[in-house]
Amino acid sequence: HNTTVFQGVEGQSLQVSCPYDSMKHWGRRKAWCRQLGEKGPCQRVVSTHNLWLLSFLRRRNGSTAITDDTLGGTLTITLRNLQPHDAGFYQCQSLHGSEADTLRKVLVEVLADPLDHRDAGDLWVPGESESFEDAHVEHSISRSLLEGEIPFPPTS
């Protein structure tokens, strides 16, 4: 798997999309996990609804939300209020039994807010030991939430 790079601005929301073949992964729940080191395990952050037919409902763990278009074949992860510590390597996974297939390897990069004048570097990336081989950059269009806007509306 090549690594796809998604860049977001600190304090804003970043949307990561992971396309997959809807028929090949029929009936499978999905997960978003964080890679702990280059050879380390992938630590589950959030997974889709326990009932697969309800995978379109947004599930959330802290500032990370996940939703799955099981028919169209797109898993979407939203990282809200992006922070420097969110930078790193992640995976979108398709779960079956105790196994997990990697749908996409993702590198999240956090850019400094251009309106923030703190004396800081403009890019947070993982440690130099982590591989950037075959990385494909995909800029994510994101925006700040409007005042009073509910980022993740409650699902009925």
Partner: antibody, heavy 119, light 107 residues
Framework: QVQLVQSGAEVKKPGASVKVSCKAS????????MSWVRQAPGQGLEWMGV????????VYAQKFQGRVTMTRDTSISTAYMELSRLRSEDTAVYYC????????????WGQGTLVTVSS | DIQMTQSPSSLSASVGDRVTITCRAS??????LAWYQQKPGKAPKLLIY???SLQSGVPSRFSGSGSGTDFTLTISSLQPEDFATYYC?????????FGQGTKVEIK
Amino acid sequence: QVQLVQSGAEVKKPGASVKVSCKASGYTFTGYHMSWVRQAPGQGLEWMGVINPVSGNTVYAQKFQGRVTMTRDTSISTAYMELSRLRSEDTAVYYCARIPSYTYAFDYWGQGTLVTVSS
Amino acid sequence: DIQMTQSPSSLSASVGDRVTITCRASQDISNYLAWYQQKPGKAPKLLIYRASSLQSGVPSRFSGSGSGTDFTLTISSLQPEDFATYYCQQHGHSPTTFGQGTKVEIK
């Protein structure tokens, strides 16, 4: 027992639309996706699309994109398939078919609805 | 789209015969293959899913095998009610597609 009962045969003129219904019983309607498959006279099977009965989300085969609309009414456990701008090549038996979550195969089928398009 | 080619397109057999129908996919579909039986004027009936799993209620004389691009449906001892048309269906890649069918006739 699981049953999918479809509406009766239809005769339509070219350019018209047809709406076929599929009433489910014997299982929880919102627990399974519903698909539509058609079969022209003496021909093979052709997948048209699928609907999630909970969300109403749909995916259609490219061939039918823009002409087919799949909907559902969960209150009466019924799925619908509407095909517009009919042409003679659309003459076929239309089947609704249930899809379990463990495999993308069609485990129960409706009895079929013959749609004849003729001027 | 993936093309599914069944062979033969028709065959004649007698009750008690062992019958084999093959299905070839135009590209690798792993084991994402199903088999159906259809009788005239009736809806198809699911026999086998995931290449070799027998659908509930289907007689054990039906079996499926294969992986990748080549698959087989076997009827170990043909019964009078087995005379029908058989279709394979792949669902390893969207959109799902069917073979053209194999008609099993009485010899």
